[in-house]
């Protein structure tokens, strides 16, 4: 592109500027010497005066002007030529540059297109390769599937034949089982008959054993009495012989007091000379009613009437009020003597209570109360205890003051609940209290964290169920 500008610089000189593309050319025209200065009487652009100038002057001035005009024209011609020459060169250069630039761009675009095309081709090739791979893989899979299908079909056939075989076997076995069932039912029937016969036999034997036990006890008592009588007879015979041999003696023989044959407790039995631990028959005070009890003639001087004993869990202690009143179990093993007998016995004389305990670690302890008695049934056999000593805790594990006795069918405790039902067994429950020697019996390694075990808190703590317990009484003045 081109443009042409004419201007006057700060000194008043004329200048021409030609802009052609990025280049601009500035031409400063030469000043004419014949031009007058502004101080001349005739300025170049002065207004013509009314008075005419001289002719010669006018002609001369015209010639000068013509010369100047001619010079200027030549100079402009030169300038035009120069410009045209220069412009041609410039135009050629510009055109060449344009062509070159366009070519470069075209080449660049072409190269880019080629690159893209190549990339696309490569991509297509990759895709083709992938498709081929995939196709091959799918073909392989199909082949494998068909092989495995064949295998499975074969296996199914094999299994079907196996199933058929098994079904045949099952039918055979079912038949056998049916036959065996028939035989077994016959055998069971005969075994049931045998069992019934054995039960009858056992019950007969039990009654025989009971009788024998009674006889044994009687024999033991009788034997002890006979021994005592024999001893007394010997003494009497000896004294008679002495008297007979003495010449001054009177021929009078001391008549022996009648032998005592009924005992209210084991202390009386012990004092009568029967000092072997075992089962003895006791008689209710002021009554002919009898009860069997175990007498411990060894511990602490003997004469102890055992009112409770636990050792192996063979007897169920979750019993009714009536059973606890009358007693249950076997005096040879686990038993409860009976609240009524103990109440009557301890109501007449002052008794001490000794409680012996054994844990599962081989330790033993005891609690001794120097005064113990049970109130009557009308007061729910309320327990009264004073004067605790012993090794099974400094604090009484039987709540103080004494509580009423409770059983599963007679709730007399101080709890909103039913202690006997929850903790098992009949006991002097408070709410529910630190002890229960009539709780559920638990074997070793199952005896901790028990809610309803055989408990004596102030010796073994909560939840510990003891191995063995014995409650025994004896007159305080023994």
């Amino acid at each position: 592109y081109s443009n042409f500008r004419k201007s006057v610089d700060s000194t008043g000189r004329r200048q021409y500027q030609v802009q052609n593309g990025p280049c601009s050319y500035t031409f400063l025209l030469p000043e004419t010497d014949s031009c007058r200065s502004s101080s001349s009487p005739y300025m170049s652009n002065a207004v013509q005066r009314d008075a005419p100038l001289d002719y010669d002057d006018s002609v001369q001035r015209l010639q000068v002007l013509e010369n100047i005009l001619e010079n200027n024209t030549q100079w402009l011609m030169k300038l035009e030529n120069y410009i045209q020459d220069n412009m041609k060169k410039e135009m050629v250069e510009i055109q060449q540059n344009v062509v070159q630039n366009q070519t470069a761009v075209m080449i660049e675009i072409g190269t880019s297109l080629l690159n893209q095309t190549a990339a696309q081709t490569r991509k297509l090739t990759d895709v083709e390769a992938q498709v081929l791979n995939q196709t091959t893989r799918l073909e392989l899979q199909l082949l494998q599937h068909s092989i495995s299908t064949n295998k499975l079909e074969k296996q199914i056939l094999d299994q079907t034949s196996e199933i058929n075989k098994l079904q045949n076997k099952n039918s055979f076995l079912e038949q056998k089982v049916l036959d065996m069932e028939g035989k077994h039912s016959e055998q069971l029937q005969s075994m049931k008959e045998q069992k019934d016969e054995l039960q009858v036999l056992v019950s007969k034997q039990s009654s025989v054993i009971d009788e024998l036990e009674k006889k044994l006890v009687t024999a033991t008592v009788n034997n002890s009495l006979l021994q005592k009588q024999q001893h007394d007879l010997m003494e009497t015979v000896n004294s008679l012989l002495t008297m007979m041999s003495s010449p001054n003696s009177k021929s009078s023989v001391a008549i022996r007091k009648e032998e005592q044959t009924t005992f209210r407790d084991c202390a009386e039995i012990f004092k009568s000379g029967l000092t072997t631990s075992g089962i003895y028959t006791l008689t209710f005070p002021n009554s002919t009613e009898e009860i069997k009890a175990y007498c411990d003639m060894d511990v602490g001087g003997g004469g102890w009437t055992v009112i409770q004993h636990r050792e192996d869990g063979s007897v169920d202690f979750q019993r009714t009020w009536k059973e606890y009143k009358e007693g249950f179990g076997s005096p040879l093993g686990e038993y409860w003597l009976g609240n009524e007998f103990v109440s009557q016995l301890t109501g007449q004389h002052r008794y001490v209570l000794k409680i012996q305990l054994k844990d599962w670690e081989g330790n033993e302890a005891h609690s001794l109360y120097d005064h113990f008695y049970l109130a009557g049934e009308e007061s729910n056999y309320r327990i009264h205890l004073t004067g605790l000593t012993g090794t099974a805790g400094k604090i009484s594990s039987i709540s103080q003051p004494g509580s009423d006795f409770s059983t599963k069918d007679s709730d007399n405790d101080k709890c909103i609940c039913k202690c006997s039902q929850m903790l098992s067994g009949g006991w002097w429950f408070d709410a529910c209290g630190p002890s229960n020697l009539n709780g559920q019996y638990y074997p070793q390694k199952q005896n901790t964290n028990k809610f309803n075990g055989i408990k004596w808190y102030y010796w073994k703590g909560s939840g510990y169920s003891l191995k063995a317990t014995t409650m025994m009484i004896r007159p305080a003045d023994f």
Epitope: S397, C417, M422, G433, N449, F451, N452, S462
Partner: nanobody, 124 residues
């Protein structure tokens, strides 16, 4: 088998808080009274708090009233003891215990199943 497992004990500054947990198994959780007891060195075991121990309510020893809160999650068979504003005198081994009998008093002998305990130390 009845089991009680305590957790959450530790060392805490006076005025701080701790939450003890007791996971129970081997018994019908919601039928039993559950209690927290503590035993400081050389002292007797004492009751702190119990739940379902008086007609289904909660009970607190005077020394912890207003600071400790007992709660239980029957679905998780767990009883909690939230202890706030702890004092140095609260330092003890804390035991979780269960009783078959609902009751209003916090006597250790009434609780027959016990955990092994978790130590709580409150420093001044």
């Amino acid at each position: 088998e009845v089991q009680l497992v305590e957790s959450g004990g530790g060392l805490v500054q006076a005025g701080g808080s701790l939450r003890l947990s007791c996971a129970a198994s081997g018994f019908t959780f919601d039928d039993y009274a559950l209690g927290w007891f503590r035993q400081a060195a050389g002292k007797e075991r004492e009751g702190v708090s119990c739940i379902r121990c008086s007609d289904g309510s909660t009970y607190y020893a005077d020394s912890v009233k207003g600071r400790f809160t007992i709660s239980s999650d029957n679905a998780k068979n767990t009883v909690y003891l939230q202890m706030n504003s702890l004092k140095p005198e609260d330092t003890a081994v804390y035991y979780c215990a269960a009783s078959i009998v609902p009751r209003s008093k916090l006597e250790p002998y009434e609780y027959d199943a016990w955990g092994q305990g978790t130590l709580v130390t409150v420093s001044s």
